[in-house]
């Protein structure tokens, strides 16, 4: 039976059982400060003209963007401004062949974060340059509160506690 | 626990809802799924509303059957029911951790005549 | 879409003996499979999920095997208690979008 098409954010380790995983911790921060949401300056790399992109020095290209795999682990807000100091962003998935593309680069099991998570005050899951999930195009299973942000594994999407520490990937 | 009311005696397409009332579940963390049994007949998955409130339907339901929530109940709506949709309509939590999808905790059912 | 094939429909055993149930997927699902077991006027109870992780509870007669489209429960040592119809239930999920499906069912009945 179809459910629906698109990328699954599957729950986060535990089961849903406990009617409370974690407590809301009030708004995310980085720097000190509310996330922003990206802005379009932020997003310097246009899509198209794949063939105009000159991607920096370890950082892959793929319809038009570049893509950064860290080695190294951080929590999600972590993750997110050691991107946009970059002048990048955590990785937003557009499609399906966006994905392949990911997982064939990643070559590990565990999770990695990239730039999704539920905003408190718009109360949806919501991609780091501001717009919302498409639920017809994105299943997202786990956690819909504060202090849930996003990683993915093996072509899926999990829900995880911002906090934890992992792998991320940065995108311009 | 999960306990699901609403079952009745309906006439062919008058709209029915079914509601399942939750208890010590945090339907912010848990999808719920709605399955039917006709009876005598085998187990039929109807639709999931998951956390976020977005709702996702068996390709047979879609058009025929609405889920919706509050922070504590969990409603099914049967847009125009037919005689095929007789059967207990049970409410089900998913408690699958990580990669898995399971359902361990179901209602007792409540059952709908048309 | 993923289509769950369980055969038998239905099998009898005496006190004792061994039931053999099995479940065939479409397509390759992993390990994400569940069985479940329903009693009349009863809602279905979950006895095995990640094709062989035995839910909390549950007896150890019950056991789950298999991974793909290949799955096996096997009820060894049957009590009369273990009178019931079992059903599989598969997720395939991915990229590709997300299915759940039922098994037809199997009814134990117990001598």
């Known amino acids: 039976l179809l459910v629906s098409q698109g990328v699954l954010l599957k729950c986060q380790k535990g089961s849903c059982s406990n009617a409370t995983q974690y407590e809301d911790t009030g708004d995310l921060k980085v720097n000190n400060g509310t996330r922003r949401n990206i802005s379009n300056k932020d997003l310097c790399a246009s899509r198209s003209a794949d063939q105009t992109v000159l991607c920096q020095s370890e950082w892959l290209k793929y319809q038009g963007k570049c893509y950064w795999f860290s080695n190294e682990m951080k929590s999600w807000s972590d993750s997110y401004v050691y991107c946009l100091e970059r002048k990048s962003h955590l990785l937003i998935i557009h499609d399906q062949l966006e994905m392949a593309f990911i997982q064939k680069n990643l070559r590990q099991l565990n999770y990695v974060w990239i730039g999704l998570n539920f905003t408190s005050l718009k109360m949806t899951w919501t991609w780091v340059d501001g717009s919302p999930i498409d639920s017809k195009i994105f299943f997202i299973k786990g956690p819909a509160k504060e202090n849930s942000c996003a990683a993915i594994k093996e072509s899926k999407i999990f829900s995880e506690t911002c906090s934890s520490v992992f792998k991320w990937i940065c995108q311009y | 626990s999960v306990e699901e009311s609403g079952g009745r005696l309906v006439t062919p397409g008058t709209p029915l809802t079914l509601t399942c009332t939750v208890s010590?579940?945090?339907?912010?963390?848990?999808?719920m799924i709605w399955v039917r049994q006709a009876p005598g007949e085998g187990l039929e998955y109807i639709g999931l509303i998951n956390t976020d409130g977005s709702a996702y339907y068996a390709s047979w339901a879609k058009g025929r059957f609405t889920i919706s929530k509050t922070s504590t109940t969990v409603d099914l709506k049967i847009t125009s029911p037919t005689t095929e949709d007789t059967a207990t309509y049970f409410c089900v939590r998913d408690g699958g951790t990580d990669d898995h999808f399971y359902f361990n905790l179901w209602g007792q059912g409540t059952l709908v005549t048309v | 879409d993923v289509v769950m094939t369980q055969t038998p429909a239905s099998v009898s055993e005496p006190v004792g003996g061994t039931v053999t149930i099995k479940c065939q997927a479409s397509?390759?699902?992993?390990?994400?499979l569940a069985w479940y077991q329903q009693k009349p006027g009863q809602p279905p109870k979950l006895l095995i999920y990640s094709a062989s992780t035995l839910e909390s509870g549950v007896s150890s007669r019950f056991k789950g095997s298999g991974s793909g489209t290949e799955f096996t429960l096997t009820i060894s040592g049957v009590q009369c208690a273990d009178a019931a119809t079992y059903y599989c239930?598969?997720?395939?999920?991915?990229?590709?979008?997300?299915?759940?499906?039922f098994g037809g069912g199997t009814e134990v009945v117990v001598k």
């Open positions: 010590g579940i945090d339907l912010s963390s848990c999808a």
């Open positions: 239930q598969c997720t395939d999920y991915g990229s590709s979008g997300l299915f759940f499906a």
């Open positions: 397509q390759s699902i992993g390990r994400n």
